[in-house]
């Protein structure tokens, strides 16, 4: 079936704001009045794995950007990257898995964990200006948890 | 070789709890999910829910208040509970491994046990 | 949920025949289609997947076709081991669903 997607932003439980930080970097930070507009805008696709009762895989494409969340494994530690794509053949519905993430819903916030590296987040440092980054830890001091703002597309 | 083999009781009290086991040989549970299906006498085929390798389960609307899916990674074996049964839930129960082809099919179930006939009758 | 509607639900043919069965989605599923057949007694034996991908071992008179929302599935010379009920399933998006069936009875 055709790939169905919303256009969102993110923000951690500490409500810092995503951003691009450099061409294939996200950082978290605070942001306020017009500079919300620097916050990146998430086309996210629903797409097939292992989806249950509790987990959705989506898709974490940027919005009108060939760039997708994607992990992979560098120097033998799962990690965050954004990977650039065909803008012909993505979004799909049959997403590669190091491009899915298990979209968790838990007391009315999110967390994303990762599809090819199970227990590892989506997360931010408590620290403001810091990179986004996959974390194997829940419930420490980095920040595995987000809300979701729907925008319009 | 795959293979799967369903087993349980044949009879089942009405309102009592439905067990069966699926033991499996040939693939990993922790590589694959396995699904359940069920066929009343003569009709047709129902997919009832999966648990995937990491332990997930998705289970179909109309059962999930009544249905619970585990597994047993070391002795291969998936178990199915159904609680308060009901004559309609009289079947033929399948379990059956999933694909789990990432990026090209991911829920087709390819290898079926032969399936074990339950009687919901007092 | 997917409503899957396959027809028809029971058809007499003769050996050497040439058959056919639909089977149509109630929204886009892509390619993702499947067919089993099976016979009395027995589990389904998968036969086709991902819409016409034959799997290993199954003769090739056995077919699939269609994408999308619509989808066929044909016996192109029925032998006497063909007799049996198939059926659809989509594999789309949970839950999955399959068809009604189709009794492919001899003649």
């Known amino acids: 079936a055709p790939v169905r997607s919303l256009n969102c932003t993110l923000r951690d439980s500490q409500q810092k704001s995503l951003v691009m930080s450099g061409p294939y970097e996200l950082k978290a930070l605070h942001l306020q009045g017009q500079d919300m507009e620097q916050q990146v805008v998430f086309s996210m696709s629903f797409v097939q794995g292992e989806e249950s009762n509790d987990k959705i895989p989506v898709a974490l494409g940027l919005k009108e950007k060939n760039l997708y969340l994607s992990c992979v494994l560098k120097d033998d530690k799962p990690t965050l990257q954004l990977e650039s794509v065909d803008p012909k053949n993505y979004p799909k519905k049959k997403m590669e898995k190091r491009f899915v993430f298990n979209k968790i819903e838990i007391n009315n916030k999110l967390e994303f964990e990762s599809a090819q590296f199970p227990n590892w987040y989506i997360s931010t440092s408590q620290a403001e200006n810091m990179p986004v980054f996959l974390g194997g830890t829940k419930g420490g001091q980095d920040i595995t948890d987000f809300t979701m703002q729907f925008v319009s597309s | 070789e795959v293979q799967l083999q369903e087993s349980g009781p044949g009879l089942v009290k009405p309102s009592e709890t439905l067990s069966l086991t699926c033991t499996v040989s040939?693939?990993?549970?922790?590589?694959?999910?396995v699904s359940w299906i069920r066929q009343p006498p003569g009709k047709g085929l129902e997919w009832i829910g999966l648990i995937w390798g990491g332990g997930d389960t998705y289970y179909n609307s109309p059962l999930k208040s009544r249905l619970t899916i585990s597994k047993d990674n070391s002795k291969s074996q998936v178990s199915l509970k159904l609680s308060s049964v009901t004559a309609a839930d009289t079947a033929v129960y399948y379990c059956?491994?999933?694909?789990?082809?990432?990026?090209?099919?991911?829920?087709?179930?390819?290898?079926w046990g032969q399936g074990t006939l339950v009687t919901v009758s007092s | 949920d997917i409503q899957m509607t396959q027809s028809p639900s029971s058809l007499s043919a003769s050996v050497g025949d040439r058959v056919t069965i639909t089977c149509q989605a109630s929204?886009?599923?892509?390619?993702?289609m499947n067919w089993y057949q099976q016979k009395p007694g027995k589990a389904p034996k998968l036969l086709i997947s991902l819409g016409n991908i034959l799997r290993p071992g199954v003769p090739s008179r056995f077919s699939g076709s269609g994408s999308g929302t619509d989808f066929t599935f044909t016996i192109s010379s029925l032998q006497p081991e063909d007799f049996a009920t198939y059926y659809c399933?989509?594999?789309?998006?949970?839950?999955?669903?399959f068809g009604q069936g189709t009794k492919l009875e001899i003649k």
């Open positions: 929204q886009d599923i892509d390619m993702d």
């Open positions: 059956a491994k999933v694909r789990n082809l990432w990026g090209y099919d991911m829920y087709t179930m390819d290898y």
């Open positions: 040939g693939f990993s549970l922790r590589d694959f999910g």
């Open positions: 399933l989509q594999s789309d998006s949970f839950p999955l669903t």
